[in-house]
């Protein structure tokens, strides 16, 4: 099956790479604008220059294009704990990230939040914290993993999933309760 091409892709595919078809005259192929610039005016005729202008401050284009406007620079989301790794330039968008000893959690494809890496208190580090993944902890005996923290089995209730890991402790607690004075 031939993939369905959008109108713009169809128009571009008629011209050689690095060129696009003139929107008013499909017999003319114009040279695309370099990254960091945008299309101000189409080329007037074959072999003539496309009028490209540099992106203004706060905007960019990261690849060759025939966009009528540059793209707005992204802003790092302070409310999500993000910090600026590198600022926006005419040919590259802002790069946002997290502070040291933090990782990114993606709530969706284009939204991430920064969280502190787990320290694995009352446990050991199974896998170190990475850019997009929290530390993986293995808990010591008498502790179970809850929300990536090692929690004492004394906090394990029978209804929770921790009962298998904490079974001896649960029995001890139960035994203590049963041995009350009558």
């Amino acid at each position: 099956l031939v993939p369905h091409l959008g109108d713009r892709e169809k128009r571009d595919s008629v011209c050689p790479q690095g060129k696009y078809i003139h929107p008013q005259n499909n017999s003319i192929c114009c040279t695309k604008c370099h990254k960091g610039t945008y299309l101000y005016n189409d080329c007037p005729g074959p072999g003539q220059d496309t009028d490209c202008r540099e992106c203004e401050s706060g905007s960019f284009t990261a690849s060759e294009n025939h966009l009528r406007h540059c793209l707005s620079c992204s802003k790092c989301r302070k409310e999500m704990g993000q910090v600026e790794i590198s600022s926006c330039t005419v040919d590259r968008d802002t790069v946002c990230g997290c502070r040291k000893n933090q990782y990114r959690h993606y709530w969706s494809e284009n939204l991430f939040q920064c969280f502190n890496c787990s320290l694995c208190l009352n446990g050991t580090v199974h896998l170190s914290c990475q850019e997009k993944q929290n530390t993986v902890c293995t808990c010591h005996a008498g502790f179970f993993l809850r929300e990536n923290e090692c929690v004492s089995c004394s906090n394990c209730k029978k209804s929770l999933e921790c009962t298998k890991l904490c079974l001896p402790q649960i029995e001890n607690v139960k035994g203590t309760e049963d041995s009350g004075t009558t």
């Epitope: 989301r77 302070k78 409310e79 999500m80 959690h105 709530w107 939040q113 969280f115 502190n116 929290n134 929300e147 990536n148």
Partner: nanobody, 119 residues
Framework: EVQLLESGGGLIQPGGSLRLTCAAS????????MVWVRQAPGKGLEWVSH????????YYADSVKGRFTISRDNSKNTLYLQMNSLRAEDTAVYYC????????????RGQGTLVTVSS
Amino acid sequence: EVQLLESGGGLIQPGGSLRLTCAASGFTFAHETMVWVRQAPGKGLEWVSHIDRVGQDTYYADSVKGRFTISRDNSKNTLYLQMNSLRAEDTAVYYCAVLPKRGPWFDYRGQGTLVTVSS
């Protein structure tokens, strides 16, 4: 005790509008970034929108951009979601939540309000 109570859901025809409200109590509302998430039948939680403490910075999922508007009234401890041009795919239970701090789970989330978009 933190409480988040959503209201305003219901059955609405495609193209219609609804305004969801979330009444918050038990914490300092004005100090928290607030979130709307939704869960469609048989699907996972989807981040819809969030708004920072002062209502200055907002975020919208691509699927709702231009149709939904998040706002807040700190004097009333209330969060809103104005939903316009509703589509069948917006059918879900909508929850308001406090932006998590410790990790990627919601410590504080409401019981939800069901929005059904159908003709």
